[in-house]
């Protein structure tokens, strides 16, 4: 029976051109985790493997970098990079467990809108 | 399915070089990375080096960057483990891995290598 929980950021917003982390945490449930895909619709962007290690994507290496821990770090980003995200969890015995997080990447935040229009 | 036969090991003076060879067949196209580890007697099993499937990323092991090169060749759907400089501290039964996008790794039979001093 898969008594698990998936928790993640949910529904995130960044700035185009930074940087932002996807995090997914597994709890309630004493499976081991042997995997953690990471997919973006349905374009795989990394795998955290327990023996293997950290593999990303070769479409994304510029722009994708491991963690912290079993999350994912996205840089450079472009509105494309708009959309949902997955962390698919591979456990066992228990089965795979499947997280999503919304991303929306902005043009421009509105703190420097109200930074150029300040009023001495 | 991902099945994996292991080839090459042996006994070799230090100093030495052996080339060890896996091959893979089944649900290949499954594969994103493989790896090759070793297990020496009375220790843990330890990653020496892995490699993505499409060749462009690798890693070693600290005690064997610089004397063991991992490659592999699509096309024969084989992963290589070219060691040189062999030490006897580099004896165990080597073993090599295969991890799919489904979660699951695939382990072959595993190859002695023996190295005396």
């Known amino acids: 029976m898969m008594t698990g929980t998936i928790e993640t950021t949910g529904n995130i917003s960044a700035e185009k051109g930074g940087s932002i982390i996807l995090q997914c945490h597994l709890s309630s449930t004493t499976a081991q985790v042997t995997q953690v895909n990471w997919e973006q619709q349905d374009q795989l962007l990394a795998i955290c493997n327990a023996d293997l290690g950290w593999h990303i994507s070769p479409s994304f290496k510029d722009r994708v970098a491991p963690g912290p821990g079993l999350g994912l770090t996205l840089q450079s980003l472009t509105v494309n990079d708009t959309g949902e995200y997955f962390c698919i969890y591979h456990t066992y015995p228990d089965g795979t467990y499947t997280g999503r997080i919304f991303l929306e990447v902005l043009e421009s935040s509105v703190a420097e809108h109200g930074a150029r229009f300040q009023i001495p | 399915e991902v099945q994996l036969v292991e080839s090459g090991g042996g006994l070799v003076q230090a100093g030495g070089s052996l080339r060890l060879s896996c091959a893979a067949s089944?649900?290949?196209?499954?594969?994103?990375?493989m790896g090759w580890f070793r297990q020496a007697p009375g220790k843990e099993r330890e990653l020496v080096a892995s490699?993505?499937?499409?060749?462009?990323?690798?890693n070693y092991a600290d005690s064997v960057k610089g004397r063991f090169t991992i490659s592999a060749d699509n096309a024969k759907n084989t992963v290589y483990l070219q060691m040189n400089s062999l030490k006897p501290e580099d004896t165990a039964v080597y073993y090599c891995?295969?991890?799919?996008?489904?979660?699951?790794?695939?382990w072959g039979q595993g190859t002695q290598v023996t190295v005396t001093s």
């Open positions: 089944g649900s290949t196209f499954s594969i994103y990375a």
């Open positions: 891995a295969a991890g799919s996008v489904y979660g699951r790794n695939s």
């Open positions: 490699i993505s499937w499409s060749g462009d990323t690798t």
